[in-house]
Interface confidence: medium
Amino acid sequence: TLNSVLNSNAIKNLPPPLGGAAGHPGSAVSAAPGILYPGGNKYQTIDNYQPYPCAEDEECGTDEYCASPTRGGDAGVQICLACRKRRKRCMRHAMCCPGNYCKNGICVSSDQNHFRGEIEETITESFGNDHSTLDGYSRRTTLSSKMYHTKGQEGSVCLRSSDCASGLCCARHFWSKICKPVLKEGQVCTKHRRKGSHGLEIFQRCYCGEGLSCRIQKDHHQASNSSRLHTCQRH
């Protein structure tokens, strides 16, 4: 099964996110690069590069990590940088692109789920105060047994992709994150152009699966009021 995203044009009046992920008040889930807003009926991106400031990897997109833009640079100035591909040097897992992890300073494939489960944290699904408001948003928790999900399965609250079962990634869902399916061939994907169009992402897709890349669908005839589709395609 696949997941949809409430994404389209940027709008100016969407309030900022809550201070933390559900169940993790200390974990900031904030605006990330290449993000879309709920809005009109087109998917818009910006070609020019706009560095997005960050404090931790979780604030960046699935294909980015948070670091100082220059080696030995000011630690207080960090931005979201493009992830490192296979065989590139790394210092931690988040630096490597989806489908890879950092081993002995090099990004290597995680095809066989080498490190899945290495960072298994207990996800406590508690949402703090029942009526919490921050920065223009109100979040009210509801209590329904059918909303409970087993940890690691599709729809489970997560902090990072290693919290999710095989074939799933940890992607934003409102101001939390949940496990969603990694995209398969032919499925629509989100293509960020040079990480432009920064804003608040409330719904986020997973990345394309192993051996696939996100490219414009060649046979997609662009109708009025619709965007050019990007789909996961074989390399």
Partner: nanobody, 124 residues
């Protein structure tokens, strides 16, 4: 493709109430969330409220908090927006959107046209 059909709009006096409905149909396996947005004449579309089954929460814009209540029937793929104590500034076309597990292609609301929306006019 997924269709979202909104209904329940109309003309109401300030202080009055309306209940909007949004029915999602198409290749839907399950819904993670449904939400409402609105667009007043000459303004950008804005978030109003949403409900998430995955993180067991409802979300509201400050401008409607305490007056609007979002609910949903997951088995019917339908969301509702109960609007009380309506104000003239609530006048807008109200649109529905959904996040979920869809069979076939992976859709987001930019991949297909929004529904026509339902017009809410608050005026005396």
């Amino acid at each position: 493709e997924v269709q979202l059909v909104e209904s329940g709009g109309g003309l109401v006096q300030p202080g009055g109430s309306l209940r909007l409905s949004c029915a999602a149909s198409g290749n839907i396996d399950r819904l993670y969330a449904m939400g409402w947005f609105r667009q007043a004449p000459g303004k950008e579309r804005e978030f109003v409220a949403a409900i998430s089954w995955s993180v067991s929460s409802t979300y509201y814009a400050d401008s409607v908090k305490g007056r609007f209540t979002i609910s949903a029937d997951n088995s019917k793929n339908t969301a509702y927006l109960q609007m009380n104590s309506l104000k003239p500034e609530d006048t807008a076309v109200y649109y529905c959107a959904a996040e979920g597990g869809y069979s076939g292609t992976y859709y987001y609301t930019g991949d297909f046209d929004w529904g026509q929306g339902t017009l809410v006019t608050v005026s005396s």
